[in-house]
């Protein structure tokens, strides 16, 4: 074509891959008529022609453009829809009159990269290679152009460095002529790199300008033989009998060594091992004292044979022994002295409380309590309480009953029951004394006795209502060595009809609902009759 | 027949470098443990480093950690023993020991050793 | 680190005689699972490379005469030998695995 060489650089049209190419043919009036105009695709230098107008009419050629041209803007325009990278070439228009002139378009076509997908080693790499390993493959797909690949380590770019650091980048073309691109980042690490995070980067063009994707942050697997192991031992602090103890070997090395956890005999001195759990942890559920002692992890690397002996560690499980209390059944005259001595063994300093069992009142802080003039109301339970303050909830009790040598006591002297005839009555009588008293009742029915402590008892009657029975009462006798008491129970009759929801607070009620010899639970809500009562 | 010979050693400065190589033979080189050992010159024995099979794991006393590397070239059948910063006290004869399949570490095949000296 | 102390450090013999040699660790070596020993011995004869005689502390590597015994467990363990040949004569190593490798400082077997 005469004077090709001076013609101007091509048109730029910029277009996406699916989208459509808008190629304005840019003769001027002067240089030819539009409305006559061939329009040819140029590849290798070769022209096809692809598309004809004539007097303003387009006409496509048969062939590879076919279905995707059109006209627009009054025949200035040539349109190119569902464009592809195939397209990327130069097409020119031909202006026929009055002489023959060319205008040249070239078309780039980009296409964005799907999501770079990264996938690291899964194999590792050890820190020692001698050269650089695969760390991860990064693929880049369907981008047009082909995109560039950019690498980060804990979001530094990683250069190429000889013997340290190798990118390796390959790119293969889909049959939609779009690029599949393939990084392969190859590095030798260093055990500081086990959490370093590795990801990378695309960049590519579009017609609005550049752009880039990043991909998901990895971490590789990176080996690195144990230099160290050592125990952990949970909870930290003091530990108490009781507790869940875990002991458990910890190497920095990757992988850990094979683990042992050995503790000394202390009569042998011998390092006997321990059975761990699936984990390797030993667990001490509940610990004892006897767990107390020296421990020691050993590592073995089962890829060298080497192994390797922590540092022992001394596990103390603190205990408090059983508490022993002397007298162990201390019995006294009333108006005497007692001193009840408390003893335990701790592997910590100990703390020593007396409390009366009955209230909960602390008596005495110490070891020793000393009781004097001894009434017969000090008989009963006295709690020795031996606890390490610094360790919370370590502690071990013991209790004492203290008896006081007296005739029978009775808890009441007398009591009045509201009874219907014919009911079957429960009654009711406790006494304590020391000897422990029994008690007998004045009339016939089912009794049962019960030993409420050394001191006391408890005796029920199960006695059917008689007119006899409303006339002579019931009476119930304690009696020990040391002698007898009575305490008396008037039964008066109750007309349940007239019986309010509170009327039980009167005078020990029995609000049973009863027929004739029908048994009512009749324990009932008995209270003291109003009048002061000796307790002799 | 199992062989083991060691090369590289040689008169050194302190500070400086040496790497020496062990080529084995009469046995499957890459299924054993290697190590390298060496004896003073008042006939001390002291372990010097080990290698895993297959090269990943490595293993020295803290004599020589950070200035001694173990490595091997399983292709070549060599192992080598590359050492920096080099001192008096790592004048020695150096033997490269092959360890058995016992579920031990022993040193069950020794080389003839190869001499370093260190001197200024 | 676990440090192995060789006694006697020379012994002079005549040949046929019993000769005992002792080895003791800073530690016990005995693993409690296996019953067994982190010891091994080793033999030096002049002019030669160190060979292996006995692991586990008392067994025989293959090919070792069984006038050789390794005895011993825990911290203290020796090497016997029944009846002493010439060429027994050479320098006696023991060395513990059982964290990291230490050898002894070697028991010399000189003839009288």
């Known amino acids: 074509v005469p004077g090709e060489a001076e013609q101007p650089a091509p048109e730029l049209v910029e277009v996406e891959v699916g989208s459509t190419a808008l190629l304005k043919c840019g003769l001027s009036q002067s240089q030819g008529n539009l409305s006559h105009v061939d329009w040819f695709s140029v590849h290798k230098e070769k022209r096809t022609l692809i598309f004809r107008v004539r007097q303003g009419q387009g006409q496509s050629e048969p062939g590879e453009y076919e279905q995707r041209l059109s006209l627009q803007d009054r025949g200035a325009t040539l349109a190119l829809t569902q464009v592809t990278p195939q397209d990327e070439r130069i097409f020119l228009c031909q202006g026929k009159r009055p002489r023959s002139q060319e205008y040249r378009i070239q078309l780039r076509v980009y296409k964005a990269p799907e999501e770079p997908n990264i996938q690291v080693n899964p194999l590792g790499i050890p820190v020692n290679s001698k050269e650089p390993e695969e760390v991860a493959t990064c693929v880049g797909r369907n981008g047009y152009p082909i995109p560039q690949v950019i690498w980060y380590k804990n979001g530094r770019p990683l250069k190429e460095e000889k013997n340290r650091v190798h990118i390796q980048s390959s790119q293969t073309v889909e049959s939609s002529g779009l690029y599949t691109l393939q990084s392969i980042l190859k590095a030798q690490l260093v055990k500081e790199d086990k959490d370093a995070q590795f990801y990378c980067e695309l960049n590519y063009r579009l017609p609005s300008g550049n752009h880039m994707k990043e991909s998901r942050e990895v971490t590789v697997p990176v080996f690195y033989p144990t230099e160290k192991v050592w125990l952990e031992v949970e909870p930290v602090g003091m530990l108490k009998e009781g507790d869940r103890v875990e002991i458990r070997c910890l190497a920095d090395g990757n992988p850990p060594p094979h683990f042992s956890i050995s503790k000394q005999n202390p009569s042998t001195r011998e390092a006997e091992e321990e059975t761990t759990n699936d984990n390797g942890v030993l667990v001490l559920e509940p610990a004892r004292k006897e767990h107390s002692g020296r421990y020691e992890c050993q590592g073995l690397d089962l890829d060298t044979m080497i192994s390797l002996l922590s540092e022992p560690q001394e596990l103390l499980v603190n205990y408090v022994s059983d508490v022993r209390v002397s007298p162990a059944a201390p019995e006294r005259q009333e108006g005497s002295s007692l001193t009840l001595t408390c003893e335990a063994e701790s592997s910590q300093d100990l703390e020593f409380q007396w409390l009366r069992e009955e209230t909960g009142q602390v008596l005495e802080r110490g070891p020793v309590l000393q009781l004097h003039d001894l009434k017969r109301e000090a008989g009963g339970g006295y709690r020795c309480v031996a606890s390490v303050p610094s360790i919370p909830g370590l502690n071990r009790t013991q209790l004492v009953n203290v008896a006081i040598f007296g005739p029978p006591w009775m808890a009441f002297k007398e009591r009045k029951v509201w009874v219907k005839e014919n009911m079957v009555l429960n009654l009711s009588c406790e006494a304590s004394g020391h000897p422990r008293p029994t008690i007998s009742w004045n009339v016939n029915g089912t009794a049962s006795e019960q030993d409420q402590d050394p001191q006391r008892v408890l005796s029920t009657l199960n006695v059917l209502v008689t007119p006899e029975l409303l006339e002579t009462g019931v009476e119930c006798t304690a009696s020990n060595d040391l002698g007898k008491n009575t305490s008396i129970l008037f039964l008066e009759l109750v007309n349940l009809t007239t019986l309010t929801p509170d009327s039980n607070t009167t005078t020990g009620l029995s609000t049973s609902t009863a027929s004739p010899h029908t048994r009512a639970n009749s324990t009932s809500t008995e209270r003291k009759l109003p009048e002061p009562e000796s307790r002799g | 027949d199992v062989k083991l010979v060691e090369s590289g050693g040689d008169l050194v400065k302190p500070g400086g470098s040496l790497k020496l190589s062990c080529a084995a033979s009469g046995f499957t080189f890459s299924s054993y443990i290697m190590s390298w050992v060496r004896q003073t010159p008042e006939k001390r024995l002291e372990w010097v480093a080990t290698?895993?099979?297959?090269?990943?794991?490595?293993y020295y006393p803290d004599s020589v950690k950070g200035r001694f590397t173990i490595s091997r070239d399983n292709a070549k059948n060599t192992l080598y023993l590359q050492m920096s910063s080099l001192k008096s006290e790592d004048t020695a004869m150096y033997y490269c020991?092959?360890?058995?399949?016992?579920?031990?570490?022993?040193?069950?095949?020794w080389g003839q050793g190869t001499l370093v000296t260190v001197s200024a | 680190d676990i440090v192995m102390s060789q006694s006697p450090s020379s012994l002079a013999v005549s040949a046929g005689e019993k000769v005992t040699m002792n080895c003791k660790s800073s530690r016990s070596l005995l693993n409690s699972r296996i019953r067994k020993n982190y010891l091994a011995w080793y033999q030096q004869k002049p002019g030669q490379s160190p060979k292996l005689l006995i692991y586990?502390?008392?067994t025989r590597e293959s090919g070792v005469p069984d006038r050789f015994t390794g005895s011993g467990s825990g911290t203290d363990f020796t090497l016997t030998i029944s009846s002493v040949q010439a060429e027994d004569l050479a320098v006696y190593y023991c060395k513990q695995s059982y964290n990291l490798l230490t050898f002894g400082a070697g028991t010399k077997l000189e003839l009288k």
């Open positions: 586990w502390a008392s």
């Open positions: 020991t092959r360890d058995d399949d016992y579920d031990v570490k022993v040193f069950a095949y």
């Open positions: 290698i895993s099979s297959g090269g990943s794991s490595t």
